[in-house]
Interface confidence: low
């Protein structure tokens, strides 16, 4: 008879996720010379620990803290891109300009970028089936708390001037209950960063409106000003133009605005 | 998608040299790395070396810093793994693999079929 198990609202954990979290971590710290010290089934069995065998309601930062000690990474704290709703753009952007750094550009955030896990109270098993969903379920999954640590840590290692790019194709162009929105802009330090500096990045073809103005960049402008953190924005009006001459900025179509 | 084509394995003695060669098509290529891979029989196949495709950064194994150098030409879309000084244990399916232009590939997205180095004592 099949142990009855707990049905979440959210998609199960990742086919092959054990396999995956590997084999990204060796791929990684195989290109990343400065990582190569890192033990991979160690990293495997600090990211296992944080959530198996735990009720996927009850994960706590703290849970993690073994991971986050094996992933210690230095970036440049000058050179962070943060994002919110245009991750594949960011991370195109990052591809190209190698010396900046978005959080999946990190060790710990490749690895669990675009997967989902949990396990189950009292079992060793990884539940495939289901996964708490964030706002059905719980906010304390294995998920939402692995993202939010080292979503917090990314900010608080920030530092002079910090990028964001957010997609101005959005209703809400700055959202307060984005991870951007709840978790990085809280902990950036302003003691160590000068300045936010957003990118808007539009997506119509003839979209010429200045989304700067905006209330909800506004409103991003008001929380990182009374954090006595300097804020400024731009629009990227063509972001197919802006890839392009990031790549070839000698090019002549690019001392125009993008 | 993209299509793969290893050349340039064969039977070489030990301290011999062999230079494989990888040629990418396919439309939608625009990949960030590309890399050699190595699988020894009954063994996990293992990596070899890496450049990347726009600044030209390498990496390699351990095992065969020094003798082996890994180079592209972007205008033929072609990858080469320069293997000089070459050891018994370096006998192998040499594969050749690309990576998508999103960070957030598991593994390279894209593999050849693989070309056999022997290399004799």
């Known amino acids: 008879v099949p142990r009855w198990r707990q049905q979440w609202s959210g998609p199960g954990t990742t086919k092959r996720f054990p396999e995956t979290v590997l084999a990204r971590c060796v791929k990684y710290t195989e290109i990343h010379p400065e990582m190569r010290h890192v033990d991979c089934q160690s990293v495997w069995d600090a990211f296992k620990g944080a959530f198996i065998s735990k009720h996927p309601c009850n994960i706590t930062e703290e849970d993690y803290q073994p991971l986050m000690k094996l992933g210690t990474q230095t970036v440049p704290c000058n050179k962070i891109l943060l994002w919110s709703r245009i991750k594949d753009l960011a991370h195109q952007f990052t591809q190209v300009q190698r010396d900046m750094f978005t959080l999946e550009d990190t060790l710990l955030g490749y690895l669990a970028d675009d997967l989902t896990w949990c396990g189950e109270f009292n079992t060793s098993k990884i539940n495939y089936q289901s996964c708490p969903d964030w706002r059905k379920d719980c906010s304390n999954n294995p998920v939402s708390v692995f993202w939010k640590t080292v979503s917090r840590r990314f900010a608080e290692a920030a530092c002079d001037v910090v990028h964001v790019m957010l997609n101005g194709s959005r209703s809400k162009i700055f959202d307060k209950n984005s991870t951007f929105g709840s978790v990085e802009v809280h902990n950036l330090q302003p003691e160590k960063v000068q300045t936010l500096e957003a990118w808007v990045i539009h997506g119509g073809r003839e979209d010429s409106r200045d989304l700067c103005q905006d209330p909800t960049i506004k409103e991003l402008e008001s929380i990182i000003s009374k954090r006595n953190i300097q804020f400024s924005c731009k629009n990227i009006y063509r972001p197919d133009k802006f890839l392009q001459c990031v790549k070839n900025p000698e090019d002549s179509s690019c001392t125009s605005e993008i | 998608q993209v299509q793969l084509q290893e050349s340039g394995g064969g039977l070489v003695q030990a301290g011999g040299s062999l230079r494989l060669s990888c040629a990418a098509s396919g439309r939608t290529f625009s990949s960030v790395a590309m890399g050699w891979f190595r699988q020894a029989p009954g063994k996990e196949r293992e990596f070899v070396a890496t450049i990347n495709w726009s600044g030209g950064r390498t990496t390699y194994a351990d095992s065969v810093k020094g003798r082996f150098t890994i180079s592209r030409d972007s205008a033929k879309n072609t990858v080469y793994l320069q293997m000089n000084s070459l050891k018994p244990e370096d006998t192998a399916v040499y594969y050749c693999?690309?990576?998508?232009?999103?960070?957030?590939?598991?593994?390279?997205?894209?593999w050849g079929q693989g070309t056999q180095v022997t290399v004799s004592s």
């Open positions: 693999a690309a990576d998508r232009f999103s960070v957030v590939a598991v593994e390279y997205d894209y």
